[in-house]
């Protein structure tokens, strides 16, 4: 399955939108900084078969979509930017789902991939827990926005590596 060029453009658009969504200066949030321990090894396309990498990407985008689809998220961000951002993520999910169906038929996804998906889920659990502990404060959301920008950048890089493998 070849991810369309529009997919990587969508990822870039999502990054730009997320960059524009900031409503508070990060420089006023230095006390709220947090280490979410992003599972970097899950974004290393070299150790994965293509089907595994695509399912990890799918999980990453799905969890991001879920995070920004909550009521608390709606209250935190400017509505039109949030809607555009969610639309970009939804389109990426559709692209990836088509690929997941195609690729899993080609190669069986080993148990190792379940560990990778679990690592991504735990990462998002840490993010959600942080927001709860910080009572969804503006600075907590700003810290999470910065973190998701980084994870989306990692996703973009993994997609680039996948295209180079094709």
């Amino acid at each position: 399955c070849d991810l369309p060029q529009t997919h990587s453009l969508g990822n870039r658009r999502a990054l730009i939108l997320l960059g524009q969504m900031g409503r508070i200066s990060p420089f006023s949030c230095l006390k709220d900084r947090h280490d979410f321990r992003i599972p970097q090894e899950e974004f290393d396309g070299n150790q994965f078969q293509k089907a595994q990498a695509i399912s990890v990407l799918h999980e990453m985008i799905q969890q991001t979509f879920n995070l920004f689809s909550t009521e608390d998220s709606s209250a935190a961000w400017e509505q039109s930017l949030l809607e555009k951002f969610s639309t970009e993520l939804y389109q990426q999910l559709n692209d990836l789902e088509a690929c997941v169906i195609q690729e899993v038929g080609v190669e069986e996804t080993p148990l190792m991939n379940e560990d990778s998906i679990l690592a991504v889920r735990k990462y998002f659990q840490r993010i959600t827990l942080y927001l709860i502990e910080r009572k969804y404060s503006p600075c907590a959301w700003e810290v999470v926005r910065a973190e998701i920008m980084r994870s989306l950048s990692f996703s973009t890089n993994l997609q680039k590596r996948l295209r180079r493998k094709d």
């Epitope: 420089f27 947090h34 979410f36 810290v143 973190e147 980084r150």
Partner: antibody, heavy 123, light 112 residues
């Protein structure tokens, strides 16, 4: 390959103005925060200003606040430093620097630096 | 502002032996998130500064593992296990815990 190409340094009289530029290439400029750091004649490094990736937020130390303005044009992949009301103590080599992707831990490590541009404030 | 203090010169070292450079901050750089926001930069003669160490003990990309760093939150040490001629230059510590970000005055590594 990440590159930061600087220009705009000059000899200027006290009270004068100057605009420095830093042209970026080899990376997605719009995804990274940027800073200006200066090196005084006694070789001390002095952080001057910072701007977020989208350009919405900036910060300055008291020594330059109200006199210096950091800005960026993401369409042109260029960072700027507008300096006005210059003083002799602003004489330095000015470097632009890219901030590493810090995520939620806001790691402002400066992982790439320009070659520097010299500013001399003297009558 | 957080003040970073460094000695102007290191003890002269022989090539192939180890060297240590110290830095002290006026306040603990250990954040409540567990990260110590202490950085080391090297400026080789005639060059721009380059990142060596981030978050107190992590090696920046492309930095040889001869370099290591440790500290307590206030006192920090950069170690070079086997000094090479290319390691000559000024070593700066810096903090990113609080704004304004501040640098030490730099320590010049001297070779015997």
């Amino acid at each position: 390959e990440v590159q930061l190409q600087q220009s705009g340094g000059d000899l200027v009289k006290p009270g004068g103005s100057l605009k420095l530029s830093c042209a970026a290439s080899g990376f997605t400029f719009s995804s990274y925060g940027m800073s200006w750091v200066r090196q005084t004649p006694d070789k001390r490094l002095d952080w001057v200003s910072i701007i977020t990736s989208g350009g919405s937020y900036t910060y300055y130390p008291d020594s330059v606040k109200g006199r210096f303005t950091i800005s960026r044009d993401n369409a042109k992949n260029t960072l700027y430093l507008q300096m006005s009301s210059l003083k002799s103590e602003d004489t330095a080599m000015y470097y632009c620097a890219r901030h590493a992707e810090g995520g939620g831990n806001y790691d402002y490590a400066m992982d790439y630096w320009g070659q520097g541009t010299s500013v001399t404030v003297s009558s | 502002d957080i003040v970073m203090t460094q000695a102007a010169f290191s003890n002269p070292v022989t090539l192939g032996t180890s060297a240590s450079i110290s830095c002290r901050s006026s306040k603990s750089l250990l954040h409540s998130n567990g990260i110590t926001y202490l950085y080391w930069y090297l400026q080789k003669p005639g060059q721009s500064p380059q990142l060596l160490i981030y978050q107190m003990s992590n090696l920046a990309s492309g930095v040889p593992d001869r370099f290591s760093s440790s500290g307590s939150g206030i006192d920090f040490t950069l170690r070079i296990s086997r000094v090479e001629a290319e390691d000559v230059g000024a070593y700066y510590c810096a903090q990113n815990l609080e704004l304004p970000f501040t640098f030490g005055s730099g320590t010049k590594l001297e070779i015997k």
